[in-house]
């Protein structure tokens, strides 16, 4: 759910930490009407997830993490 | 030690609705996701959806949107299911599962399920 | 939705044997695959998560492997008690889908 670079929507599926190699914040107050989590996957797709809901912290959490490391 | 216990056999007619509970022990209720699986009669396992009791959030599988609903009560640490518009497709053993990511998103604790006959 | 299919659907053995049950997704889910065991009138019990870790207190005899699309889920030495349904889970993505289960059954 996105247009011009902007997630308009969340999904309301549940993503795998396998299945996203990164991810982009979106911030409202930067050009863009919500907050969002914008997960890249495997399959090259974006997808828009609410930065509120508890999986998708626990991915942020874990993606950060793993950049720390390196 | 985790346990879910969840409420006993039900027999519905065709078109009522049943609530079914699953109440957790043994654990931070908040810290896991519980879903909903259902078996039918000699069929597999089908995946009904999920709820997060920190927040409430649900997301659900297609077939089952706007037959199952899924709520929580963390006073008592208890999900509950509600199925509506019952019909005879509808007669299973329904679990309730916790679901965590820390085993790779696993259905790591089972309830001992709760039978369900839809019958006229 | 990810399709899962499990092969074979049933299948006789013996005790001691050495059992080999498969399940391939419809795409890749990048080993976000889960094993369950279910024995009649029980709840379902977590076997492998990760496609190869062995679920706390599950005996060493059970194994997973596999990745991709194809996975495998081995019994080194059957035991009377592995007498059961197997099933596969892909958890890469919701909806969460089941393969529709191997019965094992004593030859």
């Known amino acids: 759910a996105s247009n011009f670079d902007c997630c308009l929507g969340y999904t309301d599926r549940i993503l795998h930490p396998k299945f996203i190699v990164g991810f982009t914040r979106q911030l409202a107050n930067e050009g863009c009407d919500i907050n969002a989590i914008i997960f890249h996957t495997k399959k090259k797709l974006s997808v828009c997830a609410n930065p509120k809901q508890t999986w998708v912290k626990y991915i942020v959490r874990l993606l950060s993490k793993k950049v720390k490391n390196m | 030690q985790v346990q879910l216990v969840q409420s006993g056999a039900e027999v519905k007619k065709p078109g009522a609705s049943v609530k079914v509970s699953c109440k957790a022990s043994?654990?931070?209720?908040?810290?896991?996701?519980m879903h909903w699986v259902k078996q039918a009669p000699g069929q597999g396992l089908e995946w009904i959806g999920v709820?997060?009791?920190?927040?409430?959030?649900?997301t659900y599988n297609q077939k089952f949107k706007g037959k199952a609903t899924m709520t929580r009560d963390t006073s008592t640490s208890t999900v509950y299911m509600e199925l509506s518009s019952l019909r005879s497709e509808d007669t299973a053993v329904y679990y309730c599962?916790?679901?965590?990511?820390?085993?790779?998103?696993?259905?790591?604790?089972w309830g001992q399920g709760t039978s369900v006959t839809v019958s006229s | 939705d990810i399709q899962m299919t499990q092969s074979p659907s049933s299948l006789s053995a013996s005790v001691g044997d050495r059992v080999t049950i498969t399940c391939g997704a419809s795409?890749?889910?990048?080993?976000?695959l889960n094993w369950y065991q279910r024995k009649p009138g029980k709840a379902p019990k977590l076997l492998i998560y990760?496609?190869?870790n062995l679920a706390d207190g599950v005996p060493s005899r059970f194994s997973g492997s596999g990745s991709g699309r194809d996975y495998t889920l081995t019994i080194s030495s059957l035991q009377p008690e592995d007498f059961a349904t197997y099933y596969c889970?892909?958890?890469?993505?919701?909806?969460?889908?089941f393969g529709q289960g191997t019965k094992l059954e004593i030859k």
């Open positions: 599962t916790r679901g965590n990511y820390g085993v790779d998103y696993a259905m790591d604790y």
């Open positions: 043994g654990y931070t209720f908040t810290n896991y996701w």
């Open positions: 709820i997060d009791p920190s927040d409430s959030y649900t």
């Open positions: 795409e890749n889910i990048y080993g976000a």
């Open positions: 990760g496609a190869t």
């Open positions: 889970q892909n958890v890469l993505i919701t909806p969460y889908t």
